[in-house]
Interface confidence: medium
């Protein structure tokens, strides 16, 4: 901790400006008023302070706001945000999407840090649900964000937010997460015509039940093998050879290359050999 020392004569900072970069740590502690710092936080980012100097400024804010910073200060933290610990952030009440964006911008291009994860958690909990604008913002900064949430957290995503989800946002989702998201997507896209509906719902099909796959097989959709391989094994097993043939269309020949992998392997073992032979692919049950 920086020692408490009196500010030398004539050194009291009337405002936050470039001259402060020449102050030693103890001078910053003694000569910069914490309330002044709080009201002029937006200037700090434009000044090339050292990490040690930023530590002093953070310490001053901590003393001024022991219960947590107000949002007016949080919004202008800039690079000082990188100095915050998850414990600091848990004290905050962040409600503005603009504040969230400002802080995510500071961390842009890096992996999601514990600080950012805590910030997002505080923000989403404060809002009560993962609304569309929040989801838009978070997936823009972290395309894999959605798949980092637990099924319980995903249950707070309203169907209207599903329109914000892009195919790449679901790349790392596991079946438990897709189980939650699929019914929401089905509801969100229900008014679309057949071919557009299929392309929109495709990324979510890892959560689809057997009856929905059977229905899709009647719609001439030509599902690609990459999508088929992500389907739930328990949803695929009850499908007949004819249904899989209709579901995959011209992609059905790709089953041969995947015959040793789930869910294809398990599905093949459930079929009658006579039925498999109708595909002409040499699949052995």
């Amino acid at each position: 901790e920086v020692e408490k020392t009196a500010c030398p004569s004539g050194k009291k900072a009337p405002e936050i400006d470039e001259s402060l970069i020449f102050y030693k740590k103890w001078e910053l502690e003694a000569c910069v008023d914490a309330a002044l710092l709080a009201t002029q936080m937006d200037r700090v980012n434009a000044i090339p302070f050292t990490y040690e100097q930023l530590d002093v400024l953070k310490h001053k804010l901590d003393e001024l706001y022991p219960q947590g910073y107000p949002e007016s200060v949080i919004q202008h933290l800039g690079y000082l945000f990188l100095k915050m610990s998850p414990e600091d952030i848990r004290k905050w009440n962040v409600t503005s999407l603009e504040t969230l964006k400002a802080l995510l911008e500071v961390n842009k291009g890096h992996e999601m840090s514990p600080q950012v994860a805590t910030l997002i958690d505080r923000f989403v909990k404060g809002r009560g649900q993962l609304d569309k604008d929040t989801l838009d913002t978070l997936t823009a900064f972290y395309p894999g964000y959605l798949c980092s949430l637990s099924p319980e957290e995903l249950s707070s995503v309203p169907p209207s937010s599903i329109w914000a989800v892009r195919p790449q946002d679901l790349d790392t989702c596991d079946p438990r997460q897709l189980d939650v998201l699929y019914p929401k997507a089905r509801l969100a896209f229900q008014n679309m015509n057949g071919s557009e509906y299929f392309v929109k719902i495709q990324s979510f099909l890892g959560g689809a039940p057997t009856e929905d796959l059977k229905a899709l097989s009647q719609q001439n959709v030509s599902m690609d093998l990459a999508t088929f391989m992500k389907l739930r094994t328990d949803a695929v097993l009850p499908l007949t050879v004819a249904e899989v043939q209709k579901l995959l269309g011209p992609h059905v020949e790709g089953l041969k290359a995947e015959e040793r992998h789930r869910p294809v392997r398990d599905w093949i073992l459930r079929q009658r050999q006579d039925d498999l032979d109708t595909l002409g692919l040499g699949l052995q049950g």
Partner: antibody, heavy 116, light 108 residues
Framework: QVQLQQSGAELMKPGASVKLSCKAT????????IEWVKQRPGHGLEWIGE????????NYNEKFKGKATFTADTSSNTAYMQLSSLTTEDSAIYYC?????????WGQGTLVTVSA | QIVLTQSPAIMSASLGERVTMTCTAS???????LHWYQQKPGSSPKLWTY???NLASGVPARFSGSGSGTSYSLTISSMEAEDAATYYC?????????FGGGTKLEIK
């Protein structure tokens, strides 16, 4: 049937702003993205950004952030794009399109000419 | 962002000739999200094929699309006069959405 009707041609001075409109009919306006696309004479198609009228949610091509602003009025089923601080580089045809899984329907385009 | 490169930029074909144009992506695009549009002078673009190989409503059967990953193509089995136009490929997979530079197809 689905139709997107865009506002008429605009002749603007450099530095001015212009607001283009795109009126949608024949489908549920709130349930599809409205995309905006720029085409300069003799050039290809360039995606500007999109708005989902149901929520007002927007996504912008980084290149057009600060240049284009999207809004939508669900009572009149109309999407708007405002272009600010116009320069001669903004002279182009601007299209709106409806997107579900692709840009299935396009407006007729609005020609914006920026000239001193 | 995904850059789509179309080749050739301009091509001419005789009536009845087989025509193929290509679209190469800078990184992999799911075939479900790769589409082609046709544009004629003075008109808006029209959806021509969707999800790589599906013909949009009203598109003649002489057109076909194929491809996967980073390589896609649009083929006309037998060129007709009305096919003269500019064709754009488009990816709707990863934002920002991008278009190829276009292939202008003329009659020889």
């Amino acid at each position: 049937q689905v139709q997107l009707q865009q506002s008429g041609a605009e002749l603007m001075k450099p530095g001015a702003s212009v607001k283009l409109s795109c009126k949608a009919t024949g489908y549920t306006f709130t349930g599809y993205w409205i995309e905006w696309v720029k085409q300069r004479p003799g050039h290809g198609l360039e995606w500007i950004g999109e708005i989902l009228p149901g929520s007002g949610s927007t996504n912008y091509n980084e290149k057009f952030k600060g240049k284009a602003t999207f809004t939508a009025d669900t009572s009149s089923n109309t999407a708007y794009m405002q272009l600010s601080s116009l320069t001669t580089e903004d002279s182009a045809i601007y299209y709106c399109a409806r997107a579900g899984a692709w840009f299935a329907y396009w407006g007729q385009g609005t020609l914006v000419t920026v000239s001193a | 962002q995904i850059v789509l490169t179309q080749s050739p930029a301009i091509m001419s074909a005789s009536l009845g000739e087989r025509v193929t144009m290509t679209c190469t992506a800078s990184s992999s695009v799911s075939s479900s999200y790769l589409h082609w549009y046709q544009q004629k002078p003075g008109s808006s673009p029209k959806l021509w094929t969707y999800s790589t190989s599906n013909l949009a409503s009203g598109v003649p059967a002489r057109f076909s699309g194929s491809g996967s990953g980073t390589s896609y193509s649009l083929t006309i089995s037998s060129m007709e006069a009305e096919d003269a136009a500019t064709y754009y490929c488009h990816q709707y997979h990863r934002s920002p959405w991008t278009f190829g530079g276009g292939t202008k197809l003329e009659i020889k």
